[in-house]
Interface confidence: medium
Amino acid sequence: TIPPHVQKSVNNDMIVTDNNGAVKFPQLCKFCDVRFSTCDNQKSCMSNCSITSICEKPQEVCVAVWRKNDENITLETVCHDPKLPYHDFILEDAASPKCIMKEKKKPGETFFMCSCSSDECNDNIIFSEEYNTSNPDLLLVIFQ
């Protein structure tokens, strides 16, 4: 843990500490912005993004956005601060270690989004119903 002689800063944007005094370095995420994707009708997909980026700020988490319309399918991979909405949606699953896609209402397209807080967790995006967090057994796995 952080030794007692280390002064903790409340206002410093560069460092975040948890309740146990562990310092959170910025997270590693896949970060290819928007790319065309072949991911369709699968339980899970790999991002096929070759760029692993270190997020700008320690509080940022990994995000993936899957969109399908009449013309194409895209997958967006980024870092984002969960305190701020992304595509007008709150990142409600930001503490999850896995990127479990949830459908969001967007006119004219099918829109799924997930967020997660382990390194490169947006590389593997999960659509499968068996990962739905209404399942109490899964909640045990996620929060253990």
């Epitope: 005094g21 959170k24 590693l28 390194d119």
Partner: nanobody, 120 residues
Framework: EVQLLESGGGLVQPGGSLRLSCAAS????????MGWVRQAPGKGLEWVSR????????YYADSVKGRFTISRDNSKNTLYLQMNSLRAEDTAVYYC?????????????WGQGTLVTVSS
């Protein structure tokens, strides 16, 4: 018991170089991501750099990118920070830290730090 012992700090002129070392014990070093953080006088903590267990992926804060190089020698259980083109604003106590668990960005064990002073 986890122990991290930093060394190599000192007084250096602007533009100069230093190499910090961190000797690690009490955990499986070769399976653990490591990092450096620093604290300037009267300021908060700032992350500096992190390195994956095998040493093949390194990451840097924008403030040190292109000037600092993190590396490790798993056979010696030692982490390094090569600091070049040092500036007055690099003056700080430098701490090495170990990752709490693989895949997470939390670093939980620290050394006592080594002071780097950049001044003419």
């Amino acid at each position: 018991e986890v122990q991290l012992l930093e060394s190599g700090g000192g007084l250096v002129q602007p533009g100069g170089s230093l190499r910090l070392s961190c000797a690690a014990s009490g955990f499986t070093f070769e399976n653990t991501s490591m990092g450096w953080v620093r604290q300037a006088p009267g300021k908060g903590l700032e992350w500096v750099s992190r390195i994956d267990p095998k040493g093949s992926h390194t990451y840097y804060a924008d403030s040190v990118k292109g000037r600092f190089t993190i590396s490790r020698d798993n056979s010696k259980n030692t982490l390094y920070l090569q600091m070049n083109s040092l500036r007055a604003e690099d003056t700080a106590v430098y701490y090495c830290a170990k990752q709490r668990e693989l895949g997470k960005s939390h670093f939980d064990y620290w050394g006592q730090g080594t002071l780097v002073t950049v001044s003419s």
